[in-house]
Amino acid sequence: FERTRSLQDPCSNCPAGTFCDNNRNQICSPCPPNSFSSAGGQRTCDICRQCKGVFRTRKECSSTSNAECDCTPGFHCLGAGCSMCEQDCKQGQELTKKGCKDCCFGTFNDQKRGICRPWTNCSLDGKSVLVNGTKERDVVCGPSPADLSPGASSVTPPAPAREPGHSPQ
């Protein structure tokens, strides 16, 4: 049945990298320059994506696959298949309509992209702040105040030693 279906649809016999050419009695012709078909049976080839401006070419277009873009230094990809490039900011900043702005007190961003996020509220987990937060780093939560009462140890016991030359199973 599969063979009969391909007989009935001459175009289905055209492999990736070609198209079913109605101007040549439906024989399979190669995709023209700067176009591609990633699947067989195509009646047209798709135009290759061009990585221009803030986009740069990560992978060249071929007859069977589209070009892939990424962003020039100082920018990062957004969206499926890097459909947009967004300006990088420094750690401790976020991108606004007016450009890169420092994170407000009580928030941080440890990446060059994205928004500033609130510091973790250690007390919600019944813990205390061990290391204060900054614009670039979240707070580090430590043991709860009760765990630090006299007689309580805040030191984690060491892990059991392994024999040298053996990796864990």
Epitope: N13, Q26, I27
Partner: antibody
């Protein structure tokens, strides 16, 4: 321009063998289904066989056991190996490009089977 | 296998006249039918594919119609170069088969 040039025909005795060739140009041979069609003198057209770009084949059931189609994509050439030839195989043999639609044909090569 | 029967066997007409050639299939072949023209000493040439689509470079005086089992090739106004043998061919199922041909001759 699509061009198909058959060769290898001639006079052969009954029971003999012959290999026909079809040199293709003007299109992407390696991407296309290729066919052999024959025409006995003064008669109509009879489809013989086809081979896909990947090498899968299909035959007219009346000929399959004696005829073998093949292709060499690196040489842009189609072949038809004909064995155990009979007088009724006398015909002009055409190669043609296309799947279902035989869009372009060569001029044919005459095979005569006679003692 | 699918048998194609063409009629008439021979059609005698004059240039300028309209020609109607028929092809009947032994079972339903949808629109999987082609028409070819063959002149003496030449290879066949594809005229119509898919029952009604004109092949590359074919003048618009040639038209095809039909579906299922009954098909027609029409030449609206015969030119001297149109006198030839015409074959229909089905590609609904293997083996591919041809009709026996219709000879279009000058009256």
């Amino acid at each position: 321009e699509v061009q198909l040039l058959e060769s290898g025909g001639g006079l052969v005795q009954p029971g003999g063998s012959l290999r026909l060739s079809c040199a293709a140009s003007g299109f992407t041979f390696s991407s296309n289904v290729m066919n052999w069609v024959r025409q006995a003198p003064g008669k109509g057209l009879e489809w013989v066989s086809e081979i896909s770009h990947s090498g899968s084949t299909n035959y007219n059931p009346s000929l399959k056991s004696r005829f073998t189609i093949s292709r060499d994509n690196s040489k842009n050439t189609l072949y038809l190996q004909m064995n155990s030839l009979r007088a009724e195989d006398t015909a002009v043999y055409y190669c043609a490009v296309g799947a279902g639609n035989l869009g372009y044909w060569g001029q044919g090569t005459l095979v005569t089977v006679s003692s | 296998e699918i048998v194609l029967t063409q009629s008439p066997g021979t059609l005698s007409l004059s240039p300028g006249e309209r020609a109607t050639l028929s092809c009947q299939a032994s079972q339903d072949i949808s629109n999987y039918l082609n028409w070819y023209q063959q002149k003496p000493g030449q290879a066949p040439r594809l005229l119509i594919y898919g029952a009604s689509s004109r092949a590359t470079g074919i003048p618009d005086r040639f038209s095809g119609s039909g579906s299922g089992t009954d098909f027609t090739l029409t030449i609206s106004r015969l030119e001297p170069e149109d006198f030839a043998v015409y074959y229909c061919q089905q590609y609904n199922s293997y083996p591919i088969t041809f009709g026996q041909g219709t000879k279009l001759e000058i009256k």
